[in-house]
């Protein structure tokens, strides 16, 4: 290219279809210059024009020779250029923002623009750069890229951005530019120019000065507040704490709060102060609703479903900001709502949902919602399996007979399609409680009835009931307790009877024991005693309770004594006992010792004893007839333990074992014994019968039984030299080697001769008795032997 010829050819395109090529004019050329532009590849095309640019259709791949001939007043000049697509720049047209709007309540900017894709034939990726600037000084606050695709037609694009600062606080500007990325274009791709700027600003109203107003925010977030004011703002506080001011345009200021703490229920106050005023707002920092926990749906009555849940973590938001709950049933599309004005701390919430006809399975979703978010829990229930019955009411007990009653109660609800399992608690006084389960068909009218048998007559019972469905979910609460006394029945057994002959042998004394309550079946009013022989039956007059003994004058013939107990309903079966005893010649008196509280008696099995055994006992020292108490044991027994509160240690008792056959009793064993042996309480009385120069004969008496306090096992006789009323040691004091002791174990022995003594010497003699319970006290005596002759 010659100097003074066209130079600096540059080609750009905005759509890849047309290239706009321009060059610089040769120096010194004026307005009246014409140009001839020829483009040559395989063919040649020439264009005549009067300006330094030309629009040509985009050239296909390869090199093209461009010749530009300039024709002017003082001659012509020619330049040649080689043009290839790689030398061409793709610069999109300057975009234009169609619309910039704002939602001040959420501090969000909304941007809308057209990509003008209709002028661009090829599918291409576009990168948009969006710039947000704040304040009159246009500080950059956001630069973001946004990707779209050109697809041959004009497309509207939208972009939104939530500002960290309320939009009311300062003017916000937005501008955009773009960059087209085309895979098929080998030239240079460049950014478009920035669009004309658009802005959003707040038209202040007279009221609101601080932004945002009454904002709900997540605990831990950062938030910016500002004060739009014509007055100079002097300070800002959150709660009672000052915050540094950030100066905006004019007198407007902002504060930035980081990691905000949870608010009190009344919110957190944010205030800005001026010389004469305070402007403020309230912020509510809390949490979105936690997932409802332990969601449980059940029914009391198959009419209404109660869904309850625990709200979980406290949101710290109350009143209009509190969590609202909606319970949606998906099969029916029905829902119920709960709006809490106050959020309690951690208590259970509940909603009631009316059951739908012919629907048993419910799919519930519990939606929780507050200004910070939502959460949900779901539960699928077959409601017939989730029945928690009401507490049974109107619980009543009525007699059927002496061993059966009718229980009735009220259980509200329509249970026609299900069965109940009810648990009846039966409690007798001073007895373990019994539980009985009954299955009953559910009814529509809420009234239930059940019969309860196998009870005892004339027994005070306490009943209560609770119910669950057969497909167990929960027991109802227990009903109120009901006390009921069953009616009387005839006594089921005759009294436990015994007989003794009077001490003169002329009268038979009949004894019987009161019937236990479970055999009396009512209040015993009287007893009938009769005696019968082969010839006759003699009845005594009726004996009123509480007398438990009768006396009949009888000869020594054999009679059967019969005792019958009577209550208001009837008589017991008779208890029979023979008056005569079956003789037993070969009886020895045995000794028995107990175990502190009772005494164990054993015997050999005797097949002849067909009715029972009787053990009778009495205090040995008491006069006849000897009867303190008796006990009957079955005929297959071979042992029993006799215990009585009246037994005392150291007291001798007589025990008699009788066997029974055909109502007649035979004395099988006679025993004397102690529940517990003690040491004797007295020493034996003893005397010196004879003395010589070398011996002494001592004689002693029996200790009375009452004072022995156990079976006598022997005597301890101590003797040694010693004088009365001297300081010499007494016989029983320890450390004396010259004391001799004799243990006399033959308890029939009543004398003792002590030999090999010294003459004319004083001896100290001591005698003690002992039982297995211990050694008794001592009795002592001083004796002087005779002089040797």
């Amino acid at each position: 290219q010659k100097k003074g010829a066209p130079h600096d050819l540059k080609c750009v395109t905005n759509n890849l279809q047309v290239w706009n090529c321009s060059w610089k004019a040769p120096s010194g050329t004026g307005r009246g210059t014409d140009y001839e532009v020829c483009i040559e590849n395989r063919s040649r095309s020439c264009y005549q024009l009067e300006k330094t640019s030309i629009k040509i259709p985009a050239l296909s791949h390869g090199d093209y020779e461009i010749t530009i001939n300039s024709l002017h007043d003082f001659g012509s000049s020619t330049s040649k250029f080689t043009l290839n697509e790689q030398n061409v720049s793709l610069i999109p047209d300057t975009p234009e923002i169609l619309n910039l709007s704002a939602d001040f309540s959420t501090s969000t900017l909304y941007l809308k623009w057209n990509d003008r894709g209709s002028v661009f034939p090829h599918r291409s990726n576009v990168i948009w750069e969006i710039k947000v600037l704040r304040k009159e000084s246009m500080e950059l606050v956001k630069l973001v890229t946004h990707n779209t695709t050109l697809n041959g037609k004009d497309t509207l694009h939208h972009w939104s951005w939530a500002s960290d600062m309320p939009l009311e606080c300062a003017i916000h500007f937005v501008e955009i530019r773009c960059y087209i990325d085309n895979l098929h274009f080998s030239g240079l791709e460049e950014w478009s120019d920035w669009s004309p700027v658009k802005n959003i600003s707040w038209i202040p109203d007279s009221q609101t000065k601080v932004f945002p107003q009454d904002k709900v925010i997540l605990v831990g977030s950062d938030i910016t507040f500002c004060c739009v004011s014509q007055e100079k703002v002097l300070s800002a506080l959150i709660g009672h704490t000052n915050c540094p001011l950030i100066h905006l345009d004019g007198e407007n200021v902002a504060i930035k709060i980081r990691n905000i703490s949870v608010s009190a229920s009344s919110g957190t106050n944010v205030v800005f102060t001026t010389e004469d005023n305070i402007f403020g707002t309230v912020i509510f920092a809390g949490y979105p609703p936690d997932t409802p926990q332990q969601l449980n749906c059940e029914t009391h009555d198959l009419k209404e479903i109660i869904c309850s849940w625990n709200p979980g973590r406290v949101t710290a938001l109350v009143g209009p900001r509190a969590t609202s709950y909606t319970l949606v049933e998906s099969f029916s599309g029905k829902y119920v709502r709960l709006k809490r004005a106050e959020a309690p701390t951690n208590e259970s919430y509940q909603l009631l949902f009316q059951m739908l006809p012919n629907q048993e399975i419910y799919n519930f979703t519990l939606n929780a919602h507050n200004p910070l978010g939502r959460s949900q829990s779901t539960i699928l229930v077959n409601i017939t399996e989730k029945v928690y019955p009401h507490t049974p009411t109107s619980f009543k007990v009525k007699d059927i007979n002496s061993t059966a009653v009718k229980l009735s109660w009220h259980l509200p609800g329509n249970f026609a399609k299900i069965n109940f399992l009810c648990e009846i608690e039966i409690k007798k006084s001073n007895s373990v409680q019994e539980q009985r389960n009954v299955t009953i068909k559910g009814v529509e009218n809420s009234s239930y009835l059940v019969a309860l048998d196998k009870l005892n007559p004339y027994t005070l019972y306490t009943f209560r009931i609770r119910c669950s469905t057969e497909t167990f979910w929960k027991w109802s609460k227990w009903s109120n307790k009901k006390q009921h006394l069953t009616t009387e029945a005839s006594p089921s057994k005759g009294p436990d009877t015994w007989r003794e002959w009077s001490s003169d042998g002329k009268n038979l004394i009949i004894y019987w024991k009161p019937l236990p309550i479970n055999e009396a079946n009512g209040k015993i009013l009287s007893y009938n005693v009769s005696c019968s022989s082969d010839e006759e039956t003699q009845s005594l007059s009726e004996i009123p309770d509480p007398q438990h003994k009768a006396e009949i004058r009888l000869d020594k013939n054999d009679y059967i004594i019969s005792v019958v107990a009577k209550n208001s309903v009837g008589s017991s079966p008779p208890s029979k006992i023979a008056s005569m005893e079956i003789p037993n010649d070969d009886l020895k008196i045995e000794q028995v010792v107990g175990m502190g509280k009772g005494i164990l008696l054993t015997w050999h099995y005797d097949p002849n004893m067909t009715c029972d055994y009787v053990i009778k006992w009495c205090n040995s020292s008491r006069s006849e007839p000897c009867l303190m108490d008796w006990r009957k044991v079955p005929s297959n027994s071979t042992e029993t333990v006799i215990e009585s509160d009246e037994f005392r240690p150291g007291i001798r008792y007589n025990f008699f074992l009788y066997g029974c056959r055909n109502q007649g009793y035979q004395l099988l064993r006679s025993m004397i014994g102690y529940i517990e042996e003690l040491a004797p309480i007295v020493a034996p009385n003893f005397t010196v019968e004879d003395t010589s120069a070398d011996s002494i004969l001592v004689k002693w008496e029996d200790i009375p039984v009452e004072e022995l306090r156990g079976f006598l096992r022997g005597y301890l006789f101590y003797f040694g030299k010693g004088e009365r009323d001297t300081s010499k040691m007494r016989v029983l004091e320890s450390g004396r080697s010259d004391i001799k002791v004799k243990n006399i174990t033959d308890i029939s022995q009543k004398t003792l001769r002590i030999a090999d003594l010294q003459g004319k010497t004083s001896y100290h003699l001591v005698l003690r008795a002992y039982t297995d319970g211990g050694v008794g006290p001592e009795k002592s005596m001083y004796v002087v032997t005779k002089e040797n002759s």
């Epitope: 002097l234 300070s235 506080l237 009672h240 704490t241 000052n242 915050c243 540094p244 009344s266 106050n269 205030v271 102060t273 010389e275 004469d276 005023n277 305070i278 403020g280």
Partner: antibody, heavy 116, light 107 residues
Framework: QVQLVESGGGVVQPGRSLRLSCAAS????????MNWVRQAPGKGLEWVAV????????YYADSVKGRFTISRDNSKNTLYLQMNSLRAEDTAIYYC?????????WGRGTLVTVSS | DIQMTQSPSTLSASVGDRVTITCRAS??????LAWYQQKPGKAPNLLMY???NLESGVPSRFSGSGSGTEFTLTITSLQPDDFASYYC?????????FGGGTKVEIK
């Protein structure tokens, strides 16, 4: 926990000076405006002076303006009240209190007696 | 300056009583009012701010209401610990000003 401890009170003659101090602990001292409030024996509360959290602004009650100066040293967590030209009517318990607008914590006070 | 007037100056009451104290401002102070409790020989203690906001740790039997120039402090059921003096304070503008106080004493 928040603690404010006043010191420097005592008996002083009219016309003399006294400097009260208030040592703060248990909170970020530099984030709170601070006040002096006084209470004459048997009387109600009277606000005396306030200083901004950063010390940039100070306000005084008309009764002490020109005689008293409030100041703070955030590096030492301490508030001061310089009292000059004391008068008999300045006799009171002087409390230092936290909070530019609302006083949420108070010290136990220090007694200043102005008497000849 | 904004003047604050409290009434009554003394109030006799019994445990369990509902007690109301009134505070009037000489000009509108919006809701910029605080209440303090002071026991003999002790420093004041903040009860309420912004007329009705309960300070943390203060029992819920205390409540505040009002805006503009008329304000009340209510104790729903007076407890033995509540016998003390009560002061209102405006903080709309400097100088901060206190009411003259109300002494609540045992009847």
């Amino acid at each position: 926990q928040v603690q404010l401890v006043e010191s420097g009170g005592g008996v002083v003659q009219p016309g003399r000076s006294l400097r009260l101090s208030c040592a703060a602990s248990g909170f970020t001292f530099s984030s709170y405006g601070m006040n002096w409030v006084r209470q004459a024996p048997g009387k109600g509360l009277e606000w005396v002076a306030v200083i901004w959290f950063d010390g940039s602004i100070k306000y005084y009650a008309d009764s002490v303006k020109g005689r008293f100066t409030i100041s703070r040293d955030n590096s030492k967590n301490t508030l001061y009240l310089q009292m000059n030209s004391l008068r008999a009517e300045d006799t009171a318990i002087y409390y230092c209190a936290r909070g530019q607008l609302v006083q949420d914590f108070w010290g136990r006070g220090t007694l200043v007696t102005v008497s000849s | 300056d904004i003047q604050m007037t409290q009434s009554p100056s003394t109030l006799s009451a019994s445990v369990g009583d509902r007690v109301t104290i009134t505070c009037r401002a000489s000009q509108s102070i919006s809701s910029w009012l605080a209440w303090y409790q002071q026991k003999p020989g002790k420093a004041p203690n903040l009860l309420m701010y912004k007329a009705s906001n309960l300070e943390s740790g203060v029992p819920s039997r205390f409540s505040g209401s009002g805006s503009g120039t008329e304000f009340t402090l209510t104790i729903t059921s007076l407890q033995p610990d509540d016998f003390a003096s009560y002061y209102c304070q405006q903080y709309k503008s400097n100088p901060l000003t206190f009411g003259g106080g109300t002494k609540v004493e045992i009847k």
